[in-house]
Interface confidence: medium
Amino acid sequence: PEPPTACREKQYLINSQCCSLCQPGQKLVSDCTEFTETECLPCGESEFLDTWNRETHCHQHKYCDPNLGLRVQQKGTSETDTICTCEEGWHCTSEACESCVLHRSCSPGFGVKQIATGVSDTICEPCPVGFFSNVSSAFEKCHPWTSCETKDLVVQQAGTNKTDVVCGPQDRLRA
């Protein structure tokens, strides 16, 4: 019979012969022959292959480098790579999450609406009327102005989105 020019799915052509590919999680040791099947071996502990393949070497699992702010989100298997994410307070610079950047701070006049996660940055919001933030922070929310009335005091200086109100004593009417 004529030697094949194309092979079925999960096969590859070598020496005019169709050999089975190695399944995910295994690497090629030797091609098949007229008399023997393809020989495959499982990947080592820190290695993986995620497709049907004829690779002679498995890929190394990604290293989540703590010095780049990375930690393991999902441990790799023989068929999947390790997935990294960022430590608290940082977020990924790309979808591949190869390094992390510090979450931004919210400037005075803005408060933290949502603390950042491993994949998303800090969300800031302007402090509405009645609230203020006088610092640059990645954690501080807008805080309500002090209520002078509850302290039996009066407002001496109005608050802004960046400053609290200033309370003072009530003017006593003299008899």
Epitope: N67, C100, L102, V135, S137, A138, F139, E140
Partner: nanobody
């Protein structure tokens, strides 16, 4: 000159408690986010907890949530970390730091650290 001086570390049994302190000087303490980070033997730096300038807003790593409490006394320029229900995996050198502006290792200012050993 900026200085951060941690204290309060020591040897404690699993389940025990410790309170770490960090005395700060040389910068506007009450205007900065502050953090505690730790480094276990042979491991990288791990973010433990952070606190906003007013002290009203706090943030914890999942590994310490419900067990550790961060606080600050701006009148004393001091940062605290109350550690309860300590576990062997909490063994590390603990550092206080200004919240950094770059990658994890590039803290703008941080102290010499205090060693916490959890062992029976």
């Amino acid at each position: 000159e900026v200085q951060l001086l941690e204290s309060g570390g020591g040897l404690v049994q699993p389940g025990g408690s410790l309170r770490l302190s960090c005395a700060a000087s040389g910068f506007t303490f009450d205007g900065r986010d502050m953090v505690w980070v730790r480094q276990a033997p042979g491991k990288g730096l791990e973010w433990v907890s952070a606190i906003s300038p007013s002290g009203l807003d706090t943030y914890y790593a999942d590994s310490v949530k419900g067990r550790f409490t961060i606080s600050r006394d701006n009148s004393k320029n001091t940062l605290y970390l109350q550690m309860n229900s300590l576990r062997a995996e909490d063994t590390a050198v603990y550092y206080c730091a200004e919240r950094p502006q770059m990658l994890v290792t590039n803290f703008d200012y941080w102290g010499q650290g205090t060693l916490v050993t959890v062992s029976s």
